[in-house]
């Protein structure tokens, strides 16, 4: 019928399975005058034929491994053989069948692995090729360990990435392999095509001999370094060693200190570069890193601990130039006058900071010397001899020596003798009445002024009044500030008032002195006052239990997964409706009633993490007041981005003809998270047919070298497909194309005659 099997001349693509004998025509092209006949050119391989009337067919079975795409051209000719239409491209894509078995490149592989190597880090690759199409199951290879010898306690120490053939240690292997116990292992590896999923798959096996070597990349013991060292710096304090020579060592200061006093040389020796000061910083934690020649970490970093040992390099210091205490005239012997607390910057709870107190002088020495004593270790001053008389000596000055084991410091104490505290504070009002306030009254507002008076000596601890709320405010919503000159008390709001929990509060104040009352005098009802606080209701917005809610999920969670929840309460007890605001990516939904948050779309860490949205809690009914909180969703990475080329590699060229095999270096990247060690890609050619001409070899985790296997290339562009595997969980693979042009060169650049200036390669090899 017209359309599927016949029609006018136009560019077309047909797909035909390889290995099948021809059973039907491919297409019947229809000629329009003056066209009379058709002509077929291109990669016909004497298989494709067009009859004069336009019947395109093939005369024998195709082989995809010989040619996967036949690029043909069909032209319509007039009666004289002149092209009147076309030529148009006709593409025959040869579809793969599983007619090739996988074969290992080597019948035996040998490798070595360090003990304690990171689980999952490849140390050896087995590589099989299958000429079938890698884009179909026919060419998709599946590697498996058939047997591990010896097998200890039925535990596998080795694992293989079934897609890439990368052999690595299991967690058990990383922990238990020990060259002293068993220095060598043998693995039998199988490879199957059809992704290992079919009983009709072809297979091959190979043997792998593995030597276990000692791992010397270990964190050294913590180092102790005495502060203020006078030895010549730098001083070697410890060392690390990579397992092989040639590693490049560096230190990483995770704390980002303004002064980082450590260095490492290329032997792995670690030095302190200047004297340390324990009082500035008493311990350092930093990391030693070993990298390869391309700057890629060879393994995990080692944590280095340096403790700075104290020396007694700080004298005691006084709390202030003069410390003032008061003592009443009738103070009893042994009473505490106050405590002098000196400081020492040296290490706490050591002899370097352990202080002794001693009174070295008292002035005046009236009526005698030695009126006071100080507790040697506590610094507490006590009255030692007799009651003091203010009219005789209103003030004493003490010089106190404070010492550690090496240093002495003099501190000065002034002791004022004051009247006895025999008068209690008396409120001018015992009841300050009722006060009505709205619950949203501002914090810091003064709501009441109270006043008591005390007849004792002015401006001493005996007459100073301190007001306390002793009843009716267990939440601590109120406070009282005292004016030291007038002893006036100002009642202020310290925390929000709340109608819902405390509509009426019966507040009781107590007025007292900082100095103790003399024996026999007690505070009575005169020192107490009350008032009643009435709080009126204000409709308040709901209150979230947190300012920021945070949840953490893997970026590949199934749609509909609960990823977090928020809670809010309405002070008036109304129901709350939850909603989301700012869900710009449309990833989330919230249950209006419960506040549970669910995913409604695939999440993507690479689009940005954490994902921040606002949650809104709104009163249901009432005045519909609402409040807002933040919800931060931290997305944990999964390996969901295939590797790709790190930059645009168009313009690679070799000068034709090649005088010797050449090579070029390319870099891969992907968008997943790689934390400290960076990506560990593996590289291989994208199809078996490229193996005769090209070779790809890994340089490090991100770079590889593409090399020519010979020099017999045509002067044209070659598109080399490279397969890059990220070795992640699950491993992802990208097939990228590197276009490489072989061209005539003038002065090392690709020569293009005038008029052919498009797409000139710019990178020569």
């Amino acid at each position: 019928q017209e359309g599927k099997f016949s029609g006018p001349l136009k560019p077309m693509t047909f797909s035909i399975y390889e290995g099948q004998e021809p059973s039907q025509i491919i297409f019947q092209f229809k000629a329009n005058p003056p066209a009379v006949t058709f002509e077929l050119t291109g990669e016909t391989d004497n298989i494709f034929v067009i009859e004069r009337e336009g019947l395109l067919y093939y005369n024998r079975a195709l082989d995809r491994e010989t040619r996967s795409t036949h690029n043909l051209q069909v032209a319509a000719l007039d009666a004289n053989g002149i092209i009147v239409e076309g030529p148009v491209p006709i593409t025959i894509k040869v579809k793969d069948i599983n007619d090739n078995r996988p074969t290992f490149l080597q019948s035996k592989y040998e490798g070595s692995v360090r003990q304690n190597s990171r689980p999952g880090k490849p140390f050896l690759y087995v590589n099989a090729t299958d000429l079938d199409d890698p884009a179909t199951p026919n060419g998709q290879l599946y590697y498996q360990i058939v047997i591990q010898l010896p097998m200890i306690n039925n535990v596998m120490y080795f694992q293989i990435n079934n897609k890439t053939g990368a052999i690595s240690l299991t967690r058990e292997g990383s922990q238990e392999l020990n060259p002293a116990k068993n220095p060598s292992y043998n693995l039998v590896i199988s490879v199957k095509d059809m992704g290992g999923q079919s009983e009709n798959s072809f297979s091959d096996t190979t043997s792998v001999d593995i030597i276990v070597t000692e791992n010397i990349w270990k964190a050294p013991k913590p180092v102790e370094m005495v502060e203020n060292s006078t030895d010549p710096h730098p001083i070697k304090i410890t060392q690390v060693r990579w397992n092989d020579p040639g590693a490049q060592y560096s230190l990483v200061d995770k704390e980002k200190l303004p002064r980082f006093p450590f260095s490492i040389d290329q032997e792995g020796d670690i030095y302190v570069t200047q004297p340390l000061d324990r009082e500035e910083k008493d311990a350092y934690v930093f990391y030693a890193v070993a990298k390869d020649e391309y700057g890629k970490p060879l393994s995990y970093p080692l944590e280095i601990h340096v403790k700075v040992k104290d020396i007694n390099d700080n004298p005691p210091t006084c709390p202030s130039p003069v410390t003032v205490f008061e003592v009443q005239e009738n103070e009893r012997l042994g009473n505490s006058i106050g405590t002098l607390t000196a400081h020492d910057r040296d290490e706490e709870n050591t002899a370097n900071s352990f202080l002794n107190y001693r009174i070295v002088e008292q002035t005046p020495k009236l009526p005698m010397d030695g009126l006071f004593l100080i507790q040697t270790y506590a610094g507490m001053l006590q009255l030692a001899k007799q009651s003091l008389k203010k009219q005789d000596t209103p003030q004493y000055n003490l010089t106190i020596e404070v010492s550690d084991k090496d240093f002495k410091t003099l501190c000065f104490v002034q002791i004022n003798v004051i009247d006895i505290n025999d008068q209690i504070p008396i409120f001018e009002k015992s009841d300050y009445g009722n006060l009505t306030l709205a619950e949203d009254t501002n914090i810091g507002s003064t709501i009441l002024t109270i006043q008591a008076t005390d007849a004792d000596e002015p401006f001493t601890g005996s007459s100073k009044i301190l007001y306390h709320i002793i009843k009716g405010d267990s939440e601590g919503r109120l406070g009282v500030d005292t004016d030291p000159h007038t002893n006036t008390g100002y009642v202020i709001i310290k925390k929000p008032l709340d109608f819902e929990t405390a509509a009426v509060s019966n507040i009781v104040f107590k007025a007292e002195n900082p100095e103790p009352l003399v024996f026999g005098v007690k505070y009575n009802a005169s020192s107490f006052a009350k008032f009643t606080l009435i709080v009126t209701d204000v409709n308040e917005a709901p209150q979230f239990s947190q300012h920021v809610f945070q949840a953490k999920v893997s970026e590949d969670v199934a749609i509909g997964t609960k990823v977090g929840n928020v809670t809010a309460k309405d002070p008036e007890g109304l129901d709350i409706s939850y909603s989301l605001r700012g869900d710009t990516r449309g990833w989330l939904k919230i249950d209006h009633v419960t506040g549970e948050i669910f995913s409604v779309a695939p999440l993507d860490r690479e689009a940005g993490s954490p994902y921040r949205v606002q949650v809104v809690a709104t009163e249901v009914g009432g005045s519909s007041l609402s409040s807002v909180s933040e919800f931060h969703l931290i997305l944990m990475d999964v390996n969901d981005n295939p590797p790709r080329l790190a930059k645009d590699y168009t313009g690679l060229f070799f000068c034709h003809p090649l005088s010797a095999p050449g090579s070029l270096i390319f870099e891969a990247t992907d968008d997943d998270q790689h934390l400290f060690r960076g990506p560990h890609f593996t590289f291989s050619l994208g199809s078996g047919s490229l193996q005769n001409d090209w070779e790809v070899s890994k340089i490090n985790g991100t770079h590889a070298r593409l090399s020519t296997r010979h020099t017999e290339f045509e002067e044209r562009e070659y598109v080399v497909l490279i397969r890059i595997n990220d070795g992640g969980r699950p491993p992802l693979e990208g097939i990228v194309s590197l276009p490489v042009t072989f061209c005539s060169c003038v002065e090392g650049s690709c020569f293009r005659p005038a008029g052919h200036q498009t797409g000139i390669p710019t990178v020569g090899m």
């Epitope: 003056p34 009379v36 050119t41 030529p87």
Partner: antibody, heavy 119, light 112 residues
Framework: QVQLQQSDAELVKPGASVKISCKVS????????IHWMSQRPGQGLKWIGY????????NYNENFKGKATLTADTSSSTAYMQLNSLTSEDSAVYFC????????????WGQGTSVTVSS | DIVMTQAAPSVPVTPGESVSISCTSS???????????LYWFLQRPGQSPQLLIY???NLASGVPDRFSGSGSGTAFTLRISRVEAEDVGVYYC?????????FGSGTKLEIK
């Protein structure tokens, strides 16, 4: 066997027209194109154009457009060329030839028709 | 239009010897199908032209194998080995790659 038989010589006056014929035999007339060439005395060959009898399609040399008109009569297996507005410059021998389809060889020629334009 | 050039108006030759007649084109006559669209004709005195060579190097039916054609895309040679008296006449090359078809000016073969 294949033959192309052209009409006899013509003597015509300037400004007149002439129609010369080329009758074919020995093959299916509509299967192959007929080409016409001219050759002035003592000079080389010039291609005038062709006609494909099956479709009636033609193609002319720009230098002969308006001068020559090619037609074909499949019932009599005859191709015609009419020359208009003749001048002495048009005095020449005119050949027809077959272009064999699919092989594209100009393998058989007529014996030629001499046209003389003179007052 | 493609210009066909036959530089030598005539070539003298002794019977039994070989001779080459050349022709050039202003554009390559080689098409992507690998064929070169060039004819060689011989026009004997008082006769119609006769096809000798098609597609640059293929001998036409009934033509003696003393005639052969060769060339690149733009330079062509007709070679006659062991020339005979009946070979005299004017030899024309003609391109049929594209319209209008064009002839060379002809090279006359003369017997010494």
């Amino acid at each position: 066997q294949v033959q192309l038989q052209q009409s006899d010589a013509e003597l015509v006056k300037p400004g007149a027209s002439v129609k010369i014929s080329c009758k074919v035999s020995g093959y299916t007339f509509s299967d192959h194109a007929i080409h016409w060439m001219s050759q002035r005395p003592g000079q080389g060959l010039k291609w005038i154009g062709y006609i494909y009898p099956r479709h009636g399609t033609t193609n002319y040399n720009e230098n002969f457009k308006g001068k020559a008109t090619l037609t074909a009569d499949t019932s009599s297996s005859t191709a015609y060329m009419q020359l208009n507005s003749l001048t002495s410059e048009d005095s020449a021998v005119y050949f027809c030839a077959r272009m064999r389809n699919y092989f594209y060889v100009m393998d058989y020629w007529g014996q030629g028709t001499s046209v003389t334009v003179s007052s | 239009d493609i210009v066909m050039t036959q530089a030598a108006p005539s070539v003298p030759v002794t019977p039994g010897e070989s001779v080459s007649i050349s022709c050039t084109s202003s554009k390559s006559l080689l098409r992507s199908n690998g064929n070169t669209y060039l004819y060689w004709f011989l026009q004997r005195p008082g006769q119609s032209p006769q096809l000798l060579i098609y597609r640059m190097s293929n001998l036409a039916s009934g033509v003696p194998d003393r005639f052969s054609g060769s060339g690149s895309g733009t330079a062509f040679t007709l070679r006659i080995s062991r020339v005979e008296a009946e070979d005299v006449g004017v030899y024309y090359c003609m391109q049929h790659l594209e319209y209008p078809f064009t002839f060379g000016s002809g090279t006359k073969l003369e017997i010494k």
